[in-house]
Interface confidence: medium
């Protein structure tokens, strides 16, 4: 089938005191090959500080996956979710504390 770019959604949730968990979800993309990773100061975090979900079919002929990491509250601006799919890439910030969702349909 033709390429379908992912919808990327970044959320944050409270973790332990002084920390938050940030999650980057990519959904509704095809084909299934995708790079999704958290970056600090623009550089990818080590694998052992990130958790990945499997790339799973979402029932519509497209796929979904996610990556999460724990960061210090107040350092959000240093972190971005990097997505690369079918030769295109995009970078997605952590939403500020009073806005918990950030959607971006990548073209």
């Amino acid at each position: 089938g033709s390429t379908v770019p992912p919808m990327v959604n970044v959320t944050r949730s409270e973790a332990s005191e002084g920390n938050i968990t940030v999650t980057c979800r990519a959904s509704s993309f095809y084909p299934r090959n995708i790079i999704l990773t958290w970056r600090q100061d623009g550089v990818s975090l080590s694998h052992d500080t990130q958790q990945w979900g499997d790339v799973l079919p979402d029932g519509n002929g497209t796929y979904q996956t996610w990556v999460a990491t724990r960061i210090c509250r107040g350092e959000e601006q240093r972190f971005t979710c990097y997505m690369e799919h079918s030769g295109n890439h995009s970078t997605h910030p952590v939403p500020s504390g009073n806005s918990h969702h950030h959607h971006h349909h990548h073209h």
């Epitope: 550089v43 080590s46 971005t80 690369e84 890439h89």
Partner: antibody
């Protein structure tokens, strides 16, 4: 690769402030990290700070935290650096440079502006 | 801060010679993500620096293959296999693994 066009030379008095600009074209501005660097005549380079154009988030070399302030204007695709309380020690060429973090490259200062000469003199 | 020490300060060469520049860091410059962000830049007189090598040994786009980088830990080397006139200038090593990111003092490559 795109262009990084920096503002012209500045002659300023001690104690004053100056705002340098770096106007970009030819790439997706909001996807990029832009750093500012300092070079005194005949000397090496110092990294001042970076700013992520997508959010305005930034990280500073502690040495320059009270000296430099970075901002971006996404509508004009321009990065700015304001230098305050200038002394003769701040006389230097200041460069903006774009990081290249796509894929697995991880290259810091891949594309540079031509630099802005700042001279601090009474 | 990580101190980057380059040797020699000045390197007189004849065109066609091989040139070698050393860069030593005051501590290991392996990033927490296990990459080593050691880069080399060339600055010609009156120009902005240009990126030559990133991540120790990767040539940036458009950089001739006569430039090569190597090393690990705290010791790194830039080699130019056959120096051409356009290679003359000041070479800087740089580490981007630990904030604040820092440059070496520079090595001036000039005609003997």
């Amino acid at each position: 690769q795109g262009q990084m066009q920096q503002s012209g030379a500045e002659l300023v008095k001690p104690g004053a402030s100056v705002k340098l600009s770096c106007k970009t074209s030819g790439f997706t501005f909001s996807d990029n990290y832009i750093s500012w660097l300092k070079q005194k005549p005949g000397q090496s380079l110092e990294w001042i700070a970076w700013i992520y154009a997508g959010t305005g988030g930034s990280s500073y070399n502690q040495k320059f935290r009270d000296k430099a302030q970075l901002t971006v204007d996404t509508s004009s695709r321009t990065a700015y650096m304001q230098l305050s309380s200038l002394t003769t020690e701040d006389s230097a060429i200041y460069y903006c440079a774009r990081h290249d973090y796509y894929g697995t490259s991880g290259a810091w200062f891949a594309y540079w502006g031509r630099g802005t000469l700042v001279t601090v003199s009474a | 801060d990580v101190l980057m020490t380059q040797t020699p300060l000045s390197l007189p060469v004849s065109l066609g010679d091989q040139a070698s520049i050393s860069c030593r860091s005051s501590q290991h410059i392996v990033h927490s993500n296990e990459n080593t962000y050691l880069e080399w830049y060339l600055q010609k007189p009156g120009q902005s620096p240009k990126l030559l090598i990133y991540k120790v040994s990767n040539r940036f786009s458009g950089v001739p293959d006569r430039f090569s980088g190597s090393g690990s830990g705290t010791d790194f080397t830039l080699k130019i296999s056959r120096v051409e006139a356009e290679d003359l200038g000041v070479y800087y090593c740089f580490q981007g693994s630990h904030v604040p990111w820092t440059f070496g003092g520079g090595t001036k490559v000039e005609i003997k």
